[in-house]
């Protein structure tokens, strides 16, 4: 079907006073919500830095790329994007930096083509376990999401609920097994102290996982074994001290993997020997020549690849009677 070129929705920025007059009506094919910019030729609507407090009701049906960044949405209710007829083409939705602190169950329901979702830079104190799955069924309908960007969504300390932030995020990722098709997951800059052990096993399609700039101390209980499609694993700028044999073997067994480990406080003692041996042999670590020791003090800034077993000693543990106070 040929769209009429003469009356196609051109770039437009609607006058604010029109909003109330049309918001209750079904959207016209070529209208643009107040305070937004629209291009049907680019299938894009941008409502950026406009201090919007709710999602516009009169979004054009052609929208494939929707930018609602830099607003003051606060709460994303159930069916926030549900329209009649539905926004059947919406594929990429960017809500970053819009002061969202609550995303309710079913917020993204009725978006059958939604492939990319960015909620970054929102202080998400309350992310419903069913935000992405839409229902509390043990097995939900598969979500079409392929990329989920959740960088810097940790709220300030005083706004957090009395529960684990990591647990809240993981519950939303795993609910109803809806995100089995997810290929890219970004969770950078969220102050994560740990990664719940079951999260990766239930996201088998992952190609790209970004956990950079968190506070992860250990990967001991995290299994990468099922992530046979994983291509990139970003672990830069965490608090990792050492990677143990089990983790090293699992990473080495992934056929397409590239691992990024820069800027972690590696502890170069006897427990590091296996990792150093592995680093010298593996091709999976990008920039492995940049990895340096942080502790103990005598080893600070030593390059891991240049260490040998004689460098990696552990101070003997003194029996209690010989320990000094």
């Amino acid at each position: 079907s040929s769209s009429p070129t003469s009356s196609a929705s051109s770039f437009s920025s609607s006058a604010p006073f029109l909003a109330s007059a049309v918001s209750a009506q079904p959207p016209l094919p070529d209208q643009c919500p107040a305070l937004c910019e629209c291009s049907e030729a680019a299938r894009t609507v941008k409502c950026v830095n406009r201090n919007l407090t709710e999602v516009p009701t009169d979004l054009p049906a052609y929208v494939r790329n929707l930018f609602l960044t830099g607003n003051q949405l606060a709460v994303l209710p159930a069916g926030a994007f549900a329209r009649r007829p539905p926004l059947a083409e919406l594929a990429a939705l960017n809500l970053s930096g819009s002061r969202l602190d609550e995303v309710r169950a079913g917020a993204f329901e009725h978006l059958p083509s939604l492939r990319q979702l960015d909620l970054s830079h929102n202080p998400l104190a309350d992310l419903s376990p069913f935000a992405f799955s839409g229902s509390n069924a043990s097995v939900s309908a598969p979500s079409p999401l392929v990329e989920l960007i959740l960088n810097h969504i940790v709220p300030p300390e005083d706004e957090r609920q009395n529960r684990s932030f990591e647990g809240m995020v993981v519950a939303a990722l795993l609910a109803g097994r809806a995100l089995q098709g997810l290929r890219r997951l970004e969770l950078a800059s969220n102050h994560f102290l740990y990664l719940p052990r079951d999260v990766l096993a239930q996201l088998p399609s992952l190609r790209h996982l970004d956990l950079s700039n968190n506070s992860l101390v250990s990967l001991t209980y995290v299994s990468f074994r099922n992530l046979t499609h994983l291509e990139s694993l970003h672990l830069e700028d965490n608090a990792l001290k050492v990677l143990h044999n089990g983790t090293l073997a699992e990473l080495q067994g992934l056929p397409h993997i590239r691992v990024f480990l820069d800027n972690n406080p590696w502890v170069c003692d006897c427990h590091m020997a296996d990792m150093v041996t592995w680093l010298k042999e593996t091709e999976v670590v990008q920039g492995k020549d940049r990895l340096t020791c942080a502790y103990p003090e005598k080893m600070r800034n030593r390059v891991l690849l240049e260490l040998n077993s004689a460098d990696l000693d552990c101070d003997p543990i003194l029996p209690p009677s010989l320990q000094t106070s």
Epitope: S1, S2, S3, S10, S39, E40, T44, N65, A91, A92
Partner: antibody, heavy 122, light 107 residues
Framework: QVQLQQWGAGLLKPSETLSLTCAVY????????WSWIRQPPGKGLEWIGE???????NYNPSLKSRVTISVDTSKNQFSLKLSSVTAADTAVYYC????????????????WGQGTTVTVSS | EIVLTQSPATLSLSPGERATLSCRAS??????LAWYQQKPGQAPRLLIY???NRATGIPARFSGSGSGTDFTLTISSLEPEDFAVYYC?????????FGQGTRLEIK
């Protein structure tokens, strides 16, 4: 990495129909908008039209009465037909893709075919 | 249709110099504008999309700016391989249109 390979007749007589096909390799066919663009010798670029995965088309008004763009999703191919050609249609014809669904979405054609030189001469 | 006017038509500079190319639209195109580079006998190559975002693999010396009707492509320090023809293109409205091009030549 998506690649486009195009082919079709390079020498036409006036009043004949230009017919070009572009095959898509290595990518999701449904994610893109498929365009045809032409460039007369020594001149700039002219957009002919585009089609999306659903078959929805948009054409340049200056060529609309003569142009048909179609898609064959089973073969991952899309085609251009331009009827009643004249010498003014002599140009290099490019197929190109714009991905409308990637997070780093492009407003430009980010993948191009190699170009087919079409000469219209009696 | 939206007319894009590029200036200058030809720009003569030496390697290492800074190049500034302009594109003006006959009506607002928001940020729905792309820049391409074309070398003789080759298809155009996308440099910048959405007015200011570098496409994958494009060197950092290329930058785009502008919104509405006035746009600029800047090449901070010209390399020998940068001498080519540059086109702007809008995707705000159908028909999609290109500027007439700016030829960047070696002085």
């Amino acid at each position: 990495q998506v690649q486009l390979q195009q082919w079709g007749a390079g020498l036409l007589k006036p009043s004949e129909t230009l017919s070009l096909t572009c095959a898509v390799y290595g990518g999701s066919f449904s994610g893109y908008y498929w365009s045809w663009i032409r460039q007369p010798p020594g001149k700039g670029l002219e957009w002919i039209g585009e089609i999306d995965h659903s078959g929805s088309t948009n054409y340049n008004p200056s060529l609309k009465s003569r142009v048909t763009i179609s898609v064959d999703t089973s073969k991952n191919q899309f085609s251009l037909k331009l009827s009643s050609v004249t010498a003014a249609d002599t140009a290099v014809y490019y197929c190109a893709a714009w991905f409308g669904e990637l997070w780093d979405y492009y407003y430009g054609m980010d993948v191009w075919g190699q170009g087919t030189t079409v000469t219209v001469s009696s | 249709e939206i007319v894009l006017t590029q200036s200058p038509a030809t720009l003569s500079l030496s390697p290492g110099e800074r190049a500034t190319l302009s594109c003006r639209a006959s009506q607002s195109v928001s940020s729905f504008l792309a820049w391409y580079q074309q070398k003789p006998g080759q298809a155009p190559r996308l440099l910048i999309y959405d007015a200011s975002n570098r496409a994958t693999g494009i060197p950092a010396r290329f930058s785009g700016s502008g919104s509405g009707t006035d746009f600029t492509l800047t090449i901070s320090s010209l390399e020998p391989e940068d001498f080519a023809v540059y086109y702007c293109q809008q995707r705000s409205n159908w028909p999609l249109t290109f500027g007439q091009g700016t030829r960047l030549e070696i002085k």
